[in-house]
């Protein structure tokens, strides 16, 4: 049957930065078509296993899918089809009116030059030199990839690593977030209890594990040089990293304007879209040339801040100079000034 | 073994109608994702694609030949047609029967082809 | 109308030699190119779908690459029965062909 398991089956991810997330696009027939996400008998609104993608992600090179459900901002510059049957079936779909249709996005994740182990070892006191060092981040609640609590393990030791807010470890982290296939380092995820009540309901890979290391060489190359074992705190924080390969990303998008390549700038937080406030930290184009290329446009031509006269205007906030390096947006509820910016249309 | 056999070609005077069909085996155009089409090519020259027909009755036309074109289709006897009307010299061509996935995979499989001739 | 510019439109060559025809795009087709290979009084065959998949039974010698607007295929060590003309097909949108490339042997 016709479906994105299909060997055949091509598929790509529009609107975004990356060719691992954005808006599903599918090849039938004749062309390229915008996949609703009310097909297959599902409301506009809701989130799917993202394993049922799997495929998707595969065939685009990409690693695990993250997400599948409502993209939230619908271009529709060529033809949206909604299918039915089974969930990913393409024998039976029809066009779309463009104003009925919410697109369908997909997030997989970024691929991986080497893969990090997918579950931890089982915690065990017999050490297994033959097993190289390794490094794994467990996501925190929100599940981002490339951001989360750093865990070494060598041989089959394995735990979390501990971490004095004094400590000048630069080096150590970008070296770290390299080693996870991650970019480089961004900033510490805020202050996680290596002591932490253990959660009953929680599955128990997810429990501490019976060791802990401590920084030993914040300059180190090689990771077998990089920490040392030592007894497990009752309290204290662990290292948690954000690193510049994190994903989802923010997503942007431009209303108002007159076409999708001008308008102002939005936000997406979660499932809510909002206005983007004005930043000091960007005042360059370099923000604006990001958002441009994601909506799939030329570069800026210009931008320009609104007036904020209203103090109820609200919005949210990036403190980086770029959004691709926003790993959340801040919420602003007054005086927000909302940017205007014009990018090159390419089908002017 | 995928084959399709085209007739219906032969000589036919300017202005009048040519309907052409194509039988084809080891495939149905019941199988989702399946469709049969045209593409013609003129003595000497290029391929030039007519029309095609999907297993669920879609149909696409070149959009210079679309005002004098109809494709049909008859799933239970594995035969696709293809009408045009008021035929010109130019319509002078090699006329194929090919199939193709809704994946694009390309035309993956042709028909030997009819010859039709526009002449008074 | 997606308008494919095919060239060079005939060439000479000789057995073993290394081949290349390239097909050029009016705008973005992104990879959904074909290539085909006609010989003479014979329907045409289907070599290269999706730019760079071979079709069933098409030799390893015949490899497909490209992207956008630019497309290649080349014939690693050309052999006597390659002899044909080759026609390179988009279809990002409707679908439009190259006007073909006669290859001889010298």
């Known amino acids: 049957r016709l479906s994105w398991y299909d060997p055949d089956f091509q598929a790509r991810l529009t609107r975004s930065n990356s060719k691992c997330q954005g808006q599903l696009e599918v090849y039938l027939k004749d062309g390229w078509h915008m996949v609703c996400s009310q097909s297959w008998g599902r409301s506009s609104k809701q989130w799917e296993d993202p394993s049922q993608a799997s495929k998707v992600c595969q065939r685009l090179n990409c690693g695990v899918p993250l997400s599948l459900g409502p993209f939230l901002v619908t271009y529709t510059p060529q033809s949206s089809i909604i299918c039915y049957g089974q969930l990913g079936s393409f024998s039976n779909c029809s066009h779309s009116r463009n104003d009925m249709c919410h697109s369908l996005g997909l997030t997989c994740l970024e691929p991986q030059k080497t893969t990090p182990p997918t579950t931890r070892p089982p915690p065990t006191t017999t050490p297994e030199p033959t097993a190289p060092p390794r490094l794994q981040l467990v996501a925190q609640s929100g599940g981002q990839h490339c951001a989360g609590v750093v865990e070494f393990y060598s041989g089959s030791l394995g735990g979390t690593i501990s971490y004095e807010a004094q400590d000048k470890t630069q080096d150590l982290e970008n070296f770290l977030c390299n080693n996870l296939q991650c970019g480089s380092f961004l900033k510490h995820l805020p202050e996680t209890e290596a002591g932490r009540a253990q959660d009953p309901g929680e599955p128990r890979e997810h429990q501490p594990l019976p060791i802990q290391w401590k920084i030993q060489n914040s300059s180190c190359t090689s990771l077998e040089h990089c920490f040392r074992k030592i007894k497990p705190q009752k309290s204290g924080r662990v290292l948690a990293l954000l690193c510049s390969g994190f994903q989802p990303k923010v997503q942007s998008r431009l209303v108002g304007g007159s076409s999708i390549c001008e308008g102002t700038v939005e936000v997406r937080q979660g499932a809510q879209w909002a206005a983007l406030c004005d930043s000091s930290s960007a005042r360059s184009s370099l923000r604006w040339e990001e958002v441009c290329r994601e909506q799939q446009c030329g570069s800026v031509n210009s931008y320009r801040v609104l007036d904020a006269g209203d103090p109820t205007s609200r919005g949210l906030f990036c403190p980086h100079q770029k959004l691709s390096q926003c790993h959340e947006l801040w919420e602003r509820n007054s005086y927000c000034k909302k940017v205007f910016v014009t990018c090159q249309d390419p089908n002017p | 073994e995928v084959q399709l056999v085209e007739s219906g070609g032969g000589v036919v005077q300017p202005g009048r109608s040519l309907r052409l069909s194509c039988t084809f085996s080891?495939?149905?155009?019941?199988?989702?994702?399946?469709?049969v089409g045209w593409i013609r090519q003129a003595p000497g020259k290029g391929l030039e694609w007519v029309a095609h027909i999907w297993w669920d009755d879609d149909v696409y036309y070149n959009p210079s030949l679309k005002s004098r074109l109809t494709i049909t289709k008859d799933a239970s006897t594995d035969t696709v047609y293809m009408e045009l009307s008021s035929l010109r010299s130019e319509d002078t061509a090699v006329y194929y029967c090919?199939?193709?996935?809704?994946?694009?995979?390309?035309?993956?499989?042709w028909g030997q082809g009819t010859l039709v001739t526009v002449s008074s | 109308n997606i308008v494919m510019t095919q060239s060079p439109s005939s060439l000479s060559a000789s057995v073993g030699d290394r081949v290349t025809i390239t097909c050029q795009a009016s705008q973005d087709v992104g990879t959904a190119v074909a290539w085909y290979q006609q010989k003479p009084d014979q329907s045409p065959k289907l070599l290269i779908y999706?730019?760079?998949t071979r079709h069933t039974g098409v030799p390893d010698r015949f490899t497909g690459s490209g992207s956008g607007t630019d497309f290649t295929l080349t014939i690693s060590s050309l052999q006597p029965e390659d002899i044909a003309t080759y026609f390179c097909?988009?279809?990002?949108?409707?679908?439009?062909f190259g006007s073909g490339t006669k290859l001889e042997i010298k």
């Open positions: 080891g495939f149905s155009l019941s199988t989702s994702g399946m469709g």
């Open positions: 999706w730019t760079s």
């Open positions: 090919v199939r193709r996935r809704a994946t694009g995979t390309g035309f993956d499989y």
């Open positions: 097909h988009q279809y990002n949108s409707y679908n439009t």
